[in-house]
Structures are given as structure tokens and as C-alpha cells.
Interface confidence: medium
């Protein structure tokens, strides 16, 4: 999403339809406090960012409140009065849903139903990954509500689970980000465990697809 203009790379993340984060990497201006100017409507005057992100003492991004907005973000990154990067983006295409909350497990013999609080907006996939120490890689199952039943489990084995939320690509496009994973929880015989013996450390999720 960040083609270079005058050596400026940008990244946009719309956190849970609540906060937009725009960050930039400008090698040419690495020791410069670039300013961020924005508007949500093509007719308005630009506002200047009031919540900058800093890296090594210099501005590197901006956080904007943008609660449940389907808006175009018009923005300009400037060195003094000189614009070094100007663009506009439909924010929703850079959605990153929040991590699943209130994750619960309901066991019935060789199956478990994983539930969590559905987010307030739709067109999402709720993905559960799970593995036992005997599995070489994570298994995955996803549904469009946070109610995912996994069958065919061995009650004697210990399983690690974690959950995340993804935006549906055919609705939001390919430039979204999956949520962070929920905490790993381990279960055996329908009871929670501190850990599953010999389970390798789960791979860190990639930020983007």
C-alpha cells in the first residue's frame, strides 16, 4: 500500500474501525520532523495531526480517531510547507479487527465449541487454530460467527488453541490485516492446562497477508 514518492513509504492500519494509524518511513527525511495533515471530506480544510508517533525522537506516524467511519482519508505528509507525500485512501480497505475477546471452550466428548464475542460489524471470519504435541503443524477451522465447532479430537491428548479474526477478502479487499491472536490456551480431557508438554512455541502471526 505504500508506493514511494520522494522516498516515502507509508502504511495504513484501521484498527477495529476505531483508530487509523498512518506511519511513514522516509529515508531522505530520517532526521526531520515531518508533519501530517488530513481530512475525511474532500471539501474540508486540512487538520494537523495532534497525536504523533515518534521514532528516535522524530515523527514517524499519526493516530486518528475515526469511529465506525466509511470514509476516504485525504492526507499530506509535509516537510515544513513542502508536501513530500499526498494521497487519499478508502480507510476500510486497511481494516485490522481487534483480537477476539471472552474466548470460551465448551467440550462434548471428542468435540469442542469455541465461542467469543462477535465484533459489532460483519463480513468477518473467526479462525481457530489448534494442535497437539503430536501434530507437526497447526490445524485450522473458521466460521463467519465466533462459534466454531471442531470435531474428531482425541480426549486423551492435550491441545493448544488460539483464535483470531480476519476481514473477508471479497468484501474488504486484499490489503486488510488479521487481528492479533488471542492468548494460547491448552486443554486436555475437557480441562484447562498450563501447557501441553513438548508443544513447540506457536509461530508468531504475520501482520499482513
Amino acid at each position: 500500500q505504500g508506493g514511494a514518492a520522494e522516498g516515502v513509504q507509508i502504511q495504513i492500519i484501521y484498527f477495529n474501525l476505531e483508530t487509523v494509524q498512518v506511519t511513514w518511513n522516509a529515508s531522505k527525511y530520517s532526521r526531520t520532523n515531518l508533519t501530517f495533515h488530513y481530512r475525511f471530506n474532500g471539501d474540508e480544510a486540512y487538520d494537523q495531526c495532534t497525536n504523533y508517533l515518534l521514532q528516535e525522537g522524530h515523527t514517524s506516524g499519526c493516530l486518528l480517531d475515526a469511529e465506525q467511519r466509511d470514509d476516504i482519508l485525504y492526507f499530506s505528509i509535509r516537510n515544513g510547507t513542502h508536501p513530500v507525500f499526498t494521497a487519499s485512501r478508502w480507510m476500510v480497505y486497511y481494516l485490522k479487527p481487534s483480537s477476539p475477546k471472552h474466548v470460551r471452550f465448551s467440550w462434548h466428548q471428542d468435540a469442542v465449541t469455541v465461542t467469543c464475542s462477535d465484533l459489532s460489524y460483519g463480513d468477518l471470519l473467526y479462525e481457530v487454530q489448534y494442535r497437539s504435541p503430536f501434530d507437526t503443524e497447526w490445524q485450522s477451522k473458521q466460521e463467519n460467527t465466533c462459534n466454531v465447532t471442531i470435531e474428531g479430537l482425541d480426549a486423551e491428548k492435550c491441545y493448544s488453541f488460539w483464535v483470531r479474526v480476519k476481514a473477508m477478502e471479497d468484501v474488504y479487499g486484499p490489503d486488510t490485516y488479521p487481528s492479533d491472536w488471542s492468548e494460547v490456551t491448552c486443554w486436555q480431557r475437557g480441562e484447562i492446562r498450563d501447557a501441553c508438554a513438548e508443544t513447540p512455541t506457536p509461530p508468531k502471526p504475520k501482520l499482513s497477508k
Epitope: 508506493g3 466509511d70 485512501r89 478508502w90 480497505y93 471479497d170 468484501v171
Partner: antibody, heavy 120, light 107 residues
Framework: QVQLVQSGAEVRKPGSSVKVSCKAS????????ISWVRQAPGQGLEWMGG????????KYAQKFQGRVTITADKSTSTAYMELSSLRSEDTAVYYC?????????????WGQGTLVTVSS | DIQMTQSPSTLSASVGDRVTITCRAS??????LAWYQQKPGKAPKLLIY???SLESGVPSRFSGSGSGTEFTLTISSLQPDDFATYYC?????????FGQGTKVDIK
């Protein structure tokens, strides 16, 4: 395979309005944005505006602001473009197009076009 | 709005020729540029997006290059099916804007 099928040709008098529809099959209108692009006879392409049906709000090119209304009905997978206060310069082929894969700004599927003729 | 200027407006060429069309943006658009092909009475067809990425199903004789304000569409060996009008389009900043078109006709 996504297909966008538009309503038929229209003839209107100056000052009136026209509403063109665009029905998606093999996919839904909620897939990416749906935009409307027009082309006057022998002229180039002009983006009028677009809508993200998951939210139902539209964005318009400055030139058409106040005269064009773009809507979408998720239940029927249909998008609509209404242009009011028509004048002879609005005679054109109107295309609906689905936003493409790159930042939703390119158009990878197009309707067949609807000719709107404005004449007294 | 960002202005897109294509050159030439008309280009006469023969089958097998290497053809290059240029598109200039009035300000930097990074790589947010697409190219379309349009034949008379038909809707445009997406060829290239993000300046140089080939759309699925488009023949490899089409290629795009450039970034910032200068872009080119190249047809390495013109085929009979390629005689058409070509448009560039920026999608860096709303409103999306198109070039005025380049008509490629038979010499």
C-alpha cells in the same frame, strides 16, 4: 465469474433525472466498491463516484457532487446511480464497474454500459 | 484533481511493431496507476495495475513501467487484436482520474 448487468438505454429531457441499475451475479455487490464511470460520445472516461455496500455510504467526484446519488441494495446485489438536473452534456454511456484488487482503485469487472440520451 | 496526460493521442502502427504509450501525472502518484484497453462499443478492460502488475489473463506482450509522474505502457509485438484505445488511470488520490486516451490504429 463476476458479471455486472446494467439496465437498458434511457432517453430523458433536460432538467429531469435518470436512474440506472447494475446487478451483480457470480458475486455480490458488497465485493469491493462499485463505481460509476461515464463516457460521452467520442470522449474519454470519467469517474463519477463509488459506494462500499458493506457500509452503504457513497463518495462522489467533485464535479458531480449534489447531482449524483449512488446507492446499493445488498439483498438484491444491485447498485444504482441516479443523476438529476440533466443537461445535454450528460448524454453518455454510463458504466458500473467493480473496484479491483489494488487498493480498490482499479476496475476489474465492468457492466455492458447504459446509453443515456438527454434531448429536448 | 490530479490531471493525467497521455501521449501520443493517436498512434499508427503495424502488426509486429513495438508500441509505447506514455502517461504523465500532474503530481506524484507513486505506483498507483492502471492501464485499460477499450474497443468501440465495448467496456474498458483492465490490463495493468500498480504501474507494472499484469492483470490475470492478459497476454505477456503487455507491460507497464514507471513511478512518480512518468509511466509507460509497452506492447512488445502488436497483434491484430491490439488495435484499440488505451487509457491510463490514477488511483492515488480521489477523484480517480483517467488520461484522455491513445488510439492505436493500423498504419
Amino acid at each position: 465469474q463476476v458479471q455486472l448487468v446494467q439496465s437498458g438505454a434511457e432517453v430523458r429531457k433536460p432538467g429531469s433525472s435518470v436512474k440506472v441499475s447494475c446487478k451483480a451475479s457470480g458475486g455480490t455487490v458488497s465485493s469491493y466498491a462499485i463505481s460509476w464511470v461515464r463516457q460521452a460520445p467520442g470522449q474519454g472516461l470519467e469517474w463519477m463516484g463509488g459506494i462500499t455496500p458493506i457500509f452503504g455510504t457513497a463518495k462522489y467526484a467533485q464535479k458531480f457532487q449534489g447531482r449524483v446519488t449512488i446507492t446499493a441494495d445488498k439483498s438484491t446485489s444491485t447498485a444504482y446511480m441516479e443523476l438529476s438536473s440533466l443537461r445535454s452534456e450528460d448524454t453518455a454511456v454510463y458504466y458500473c464497474a467493480r473496484g479491483g484488487i489494488a487498493a480498490a482503485g482499479t476496475f476489474d469487472y465492468w457492466g455492458q454500459g447504459t446509453l443515456v440520451t438527454v434531448s429536448s | 484533481d490530479i490531471q493525467m496526460t497521455q501521449s501520443p493521442s493517436t498512434l499508427s502502427a503495424s502488426v509486429g511493431d513495438r508500441v509505447t504509450i506514455t502517461c504523465r501525472a500532474s503530481q506524484s502518484i507513486s505506483s498507483w496507476l492502471a492501464w485499460y484497453q477499450q474497443k468501440p462499443g465495448k467496456a474498458p478492460k483492465l490490463l495493468i495495475y500498480k504501474a507494472s502488475s499484469l492483470e490475470s489473463g492478459v497476454p505477456s506482450r503487455f507491460s507497464g513501467s514507471g513511478s512518480g509522474t512518468e509511466f509507460t505502457l509497452t506492447i512488445s509485438s502488436l497483434q491484430p487484436d491490439d488495435f484499440a484505445t488505451y487509457y491510463c488511470q490514477q488511483y492515488n488520490s480521489y477523484s480517480w482520474t483517467f488520461g484522455q486516451g491513445t488510439k492505436v490504429d493500423i498504419k
